[in-house]
């Protein structure tokens, strides 16, 4: 049994890492595998993360982590039963994927202004409450070529666009990822997405 | 709320011994280590002792080595400290800590122990 | 054991100013080190920790920096609670040890 794909870890810097490999054949994750993982810091332990499939020859890993500091290092370790199969390490400020925003809802009823909104997936006490900045993705259902994207780089987590900007009497559907600049983070899942009718006045024309 | 608080303090004659107890709350106590540290009165911080999570590690200041036990139990939240052959240099407030990666994050009030005949 | 030497060891100071602190250590420790602030008959309470990160619910004007020897707490406008004893701690080795203080007090 040998490591085809060498593990690879994202962190949300919050509680959880993510790491996936793969194998040189098929192979049963969680019966075969462990991927023990311990924080360089003294006092620190080491922790069992019992792997799950991802396809036939891939595994994934999720690390339970119970904060995350810029300075953090963890040793990873991927056994085997006794067999030491790979050995490295890992630096979660180093790999971070910002978590999804949330909640993500578009308020129609302010005159002829789409108000989207969304939940910042941080509590204010960690450290990307404050630098995420967000990408907004609006589409049509009607329309596969009707596809925009909006830069939000405000803190603020909600969008205002003006209606007429999109077609009225079709729907439309909207999505949001967050990524941060400090930690020169990826792009975050997008967030589930929302339906709305567009609908609003055609201004009156005069001839 | 993190909270730890001492008990156990008390007078105890040189040779004596004592057992201190601090009880957390407002973590998931078994995940991380815990201290003790100790102060002199009208001195500064001294550092006596600490426990893995899991209590499977422990580790002593040499002034305590051999007499002091540091022990846990994740089922009551409960950290110990039994200090056997007390000496008048033991004499301090000693202060139970949450630890993490090394340092003290959250400190109890303290509970006094004067040796003394 | 990694001994800690903390300068000065008292500073009187006034409301408003800034007020800096250093810790040497007597070999490397990377940037594990804390900073403590201790108020007479009360615990001490973490300020700074892994040299330069705030513990949450500290103040701003409270900042930490330094890497291997040397080591800085700094508060830029000293404020009328921030009259204590500081002490520094490296959990680079065991046995942990401490400064042994600096007292900021009323000019």
């Known amino acids: 049994m040998k490591v085809l794909q060498e593990p690879t870890c994202v962190s949300d810097y919050m509680s959880i890492s993510t790491c996936e490999w793969k194998m040189n054949g098929p192979t049963n994750c969680s019966t075969e595998l462990r991927l023990l993982y311990q924080l360089v810091f003294l006092l620190s332990e080491a922790h069992t993360c019992i792997p799950e499939n991802n396809g036939g020859a891939g595994c994934v890993c999720h690390l339970l982590m119970d904060d995350v500091v810029s300075a953090d290092n963890y040793t990873l370790d991927l056994w085997a039963g006794q067999q030491l199969l790979w050995k490295g390490s890992f630096k979660p400020s180093e790999h971070v994927k910002p978590r999804a925003p949330g909640n993500l809802t578009v308020h129609t009823n302010v005159s002829d202004t789409l108000l989207l909104t969304w939940s910042n997936p941080y509590p204010p006490d960690n450290y990307l409450y404050n630098h995420l900045t967000y990408a907004v993705n609006i589409w049509s259902e009607n329309d596969p070529a009707d596809f925009r994207i909006y830069n939000v780089t405000y803190l603020e987590p909600s969008l205002r666009i003006a209606a007429s900007t999109l077609k009225s009497g079709i729907s439309y559907r909207a999505r949001v990822r967050a990524w941060a600049q400090c930690y020169n983070t990826t792009w975050s899942e997008w967030s589930p997405s929302t339906k709305w009718h567009n609908s609003y006045r055609e201004p009156f024309e005069q001839h | 709320e993190v909270q730890v608080l001492e008990s156990g303090g008390n007078l105890v004659q040189p040779g004596g011994s004592l057992r201190l107890s601090c009880a957390a709350s407002?973590?998931?106590?078994?995940?991380?280590?815990m201290s003790w540290v100790r102060q002199a009165p009208g001195k500064g911080l001294e550092w006596v002792s600490s426990?893995?999570?899991?209590?499977?590690?422990?580790y002593y200041a040499d002034s305590v080595k051999g007499r002091f036990t540091i022990s846990r139990d994740n089922s009551k939240n409960t950290l110990y400290l039994q200090m056997n052959s007390l000496r008048a240099e033991d004499t301090a407030i000693f202060y139970c800590?949450?630890?993490?990666?090394?340092?003290?994050?959250?400190w109890g009030q303290g509970t006094l122990v004067t040796v003394s005949s | 054991e990694i001994v800690l030497t903390q300068s000065p060891s008292s500073v009187s100071a006034s409301v408003g100013d800034r007020v800096t602190i250093t810790c040497r250590a007597s070999?490397?420790?990377?940037?594990?080190l804390a900073w403590y602030q201790q108020k007479p008959g009360k615990a001490p309470k973490l300020l700074i920790y892994?040299?330069?990160i705030l513990q949450r619910g500290v103040p701003s004007r409270f900042s930490g920096s330094g890497s291997g020897t040397d080591f800085t707490l700094t508060i830029t406008r000293l404020q009328p609670e921030d009259f204590a004893t500081y002490y520094c701690?490296?959990?680079?080795?065991?046995?942990?040890?401490f400064g042994p203080g600096t007292k900021v007090d009323i000019k």
């Open positions: 800590a949450k630890d993490n990666r090394g340092f003290f994050h959250y």
């Open positions: 407002g973590f998931t106590f078994s995940s991380y280590a």
């Open positions: 426990i893995t999570g899991s209590g499977g590690s422990t």
């Open positions: 070999q490397g420790i990377s940037n594990r």
């Open positions: 892994i040299a330069s």
């Open positions: 701690q490296q959990a680079n080795s065991f046995p942990f040890t």
